[in-house]
């Protein structure tokens, strides 16, 4: 709390301008009316105030808006945003995408801070869903944003927003998240033709079920190994050798390099060795000829 002292004669601020950078903390407190600050907020960011001076200005705004800043003030916070706590931000009601962009710009180049996370949370909750424009904006600033959301939060993403997602936005998503996103992507891209569809859906295939992979294997898509390695193990296991060969096309040769890694390792263990031998890749570990394969999981389900 800045000590209350009278403003020295002639120092009362009539405008928010550059001259204020020479004011000591107590002078800012005494000589800058909160009402003046509120009307001319857009000037604050253009003036190189020190962090200590920004503390004084924040204190004035906090006092002026005990229930949280209005959007007309929030959109002009600029570097003052870095002074806000998540508790401050939880009081806000941010509805304008322009306001969100302005504040994200202040934090650009830094990791997502608790303040930014709270701001985004307030914004998305206010909108009710992650619409395309919002997703576009958030992933532009934070490519990993989508993968930072819980499956529950991702469920509020409408299929139409999936068009805004770039492959790099999904790099850090885990299977649980892709399970939610894949059906939305499938719906969003359903009217595209085969090759175009595959280009768009490829990044989401970590959430695809077996039947969709089987369908893709009939379309000469030539899936690369990197994509194949991200597929759900439980979705890959039921695929036949012929289906995997069709799915990967010329990339099938890459299976040899990945034979010790999931899901390739687990898939190999489920195939007959003589089927694997037809690939001519020297893949080992399949079921020897003459062995009967019992699906124990099916047996348990029946008993």
């Amino acid at each position: 709390e800045v000590e209350k002292t009278a403003c020295p004669s002639g120092k009362k601020a009539r405008e928010i301008d550059e001259s204020l950078i020479f004011y000591k903390k107590w002078e800012l407190e005494a000589c800058v009316d909160a009402a003046l600050l509120a009307t001319q907020m857009d000037r604050v960011n253009a003036i190189p105030f020190t962090y200590e001076q920004l503390d004084v200005l924040k204190h004035k705004l906090d006092e002026l808006y005990p229930q949280g800043y209005p959007e007309s003030v929030i959109q002009h916070l600029g570097y003052l945003f870095l002074k806000m706590s998540p508790e401050d931000i939880r009081k806000w009601n941010v509805t304008s995408l322009e306001t969100l962009k302005a504040l994200l710009e202040v934090n650009k180049g830094h990791e997502m801070s608790p303040q930014v996370a709270t701001l985004i949370d307030r914004f998305v909750k206010g909108r009710g869903q992650l619409d395309k424009d919002t997703l576009d904006t958030l992933t532009a600033f934070y490519p990993g944003y989508l993968c930072s959301l819980s499956p529950e939060e991702l469920s509020s993403v409408p299929p139409s927003s999936i068009w805004a997602v770039r492959p790099q936005d999904l790099d850090t998503c885990d299977p649980r998240q892709l399970d939610v996103l894949y059906p939305k992507a499938r719906l969003a891209f359903q009217n595209m033709n085969g090759s175009e569809y595959f280009v768009k859906i490829q990044s989401f295939l970590g959430g695809a079920p077996t039947e969709d992979l089987k369908a893709l294997s009939q379309q000469n898509v030539s899936m690369d190994l990197a994509t194949f390695m991200k597929l759900r193990t439980d979705a890959v296991l039921p695929l036949t050798v012929a289906e995997v060969q069709k799915l990967l096309g010329p990339h099938v040769e890459g299976l040899k390099a990945e034979e010790r890694h999931r899901p390739v390792r687990d898939w190999i263990l489920r195939q007959r060795q003589d089927d694997l031998d037809t690939l001519g890749l020297g893949l080992q570990g399949g079921i020897p000829n003459g062995y009967l394969v019992l699906d124990l999981s099916m047996q348990e389900a029946l008993s």
């Epitope: 909160a34 009402a35 009307t39």
Partner: antibody, heavy 119, light 114 residues
Framework: EVQLQQSGPELVKPGASMKISCKAS????????MNWVKQSHGKNLEWIGL????????SYNQKFKGKATLTVDKSSSTAYMELLSLTSEDSAVYYC????????????WGAGTTVTVSS | DIVMTQSPSSLAVSVGEKVTMSCKSS????????????LAWYQQKPGQSPKLLIY???TRESGVPDRFTGSGSGTDFTLTISSVKAEDLAVYYC??????????FGGGTKLEIK
């Protein structure tokens, strides 16, 4: 001396619109939010809305949205309130009031403009 | 919106007497971060516009006589005039300015001189 000088009384017909002015002097007009307050029957005070003279930004009491429109002319340090589609319910004294220095109390008031809506 | 209730609606006192009037808000006007109450008192003399007397519940506006005192916290507030003068004949209003920008006024207390 800080002063707010309001325009004179008005007698208007129902359905008409009218504009009240409030000329500020003695302080930096763009540094303080201007508010408008309605007083009906010589008693109840109701906050109508505010305007930021610096950038023209406005906020209205939900009750007066569509009824009042606030504007400013920075060059003459004058705030205006236009009242639309007047009815007898709008007969009242209307005040402009400057917001206080440290918060949203009103430290300077105009003398008021009496509006009478009658056919 | 916060509802402000003033009582009594009117009272008559003799010159020199002490007078108190009450203002209650439907929710607390105390902001815990600065321990300030967002309440103002105004005086409106007959035929005049309102005049600010008190802000922050207890801070007298410059030029206001010290016989006027504001007190209270949270939801209950009082304006006291320690020794009434004939010129204090007026209606007194309280106003909350806690909820930006939906500020509300009380219905007023009319002070009459016997």
């Amino acid at each position: 001396e800080v002063q707010l000088q309001q325009s004179g009384p008005e007698l208007v017909k129902p359905g008409a619109s009218m504009k009240i002015s409030c000329k500020a002097s003695g302080y930096s007009f763009t540094g303080y939010t201007m508010n408008w307050v309605k007083q009906s029957h010589g008693k109840n005070l109701e906050w109508i809305g505010l305007i930021n003279p610096y950038n023209g930004g406005t906020s209205y009491n939900q009750k007066f949205k569509g009824k009042a429109t606030l504007t400013v002319d920075k060059s003459s340090s004058t705030a205006y309130m236009e009242l639309l589609s007047l009815t007898s319910e709008d007969s009242a004294v209307y005040y402009c009031a400057r917001v206080g220095g440290s918060s949203w109390y009103f430290d300077v008031w105009g003398a008021g403009t009496t509006v009478t809506v009658s056919s | 919106d916060i509802v402000m209730t003033q009582s009594p609606s009117s009272l008559a006192v003799s010159v020199g007497e002490k007078v108190t009037m009450s203002c209650k808000s439907s929710q607390s006007l105390l902001y815990s971060s600065n321990q300030k109450n967002y309440l103002a008192w105004y005086q409106q003399k007959p035929g005049q516009s309102p005049k600010l007397l008190i802000y922050w519940a207890s801070t007298r506006e410059s030029g206001v006589p010290d016989r006027f005192t504001g007190s209270g916290s949270g939801t209950d507030f009082t304006l006291t005039i320690s020794s009434v003068k004939a010129e204090d004949l007026a209606v007194y209003y309280c106003q909350q300015y806690y909820t930006y920008p939906t500020w509300t006024f009380g219905g007023g207390t009319k002070l009459e001189i016997k």
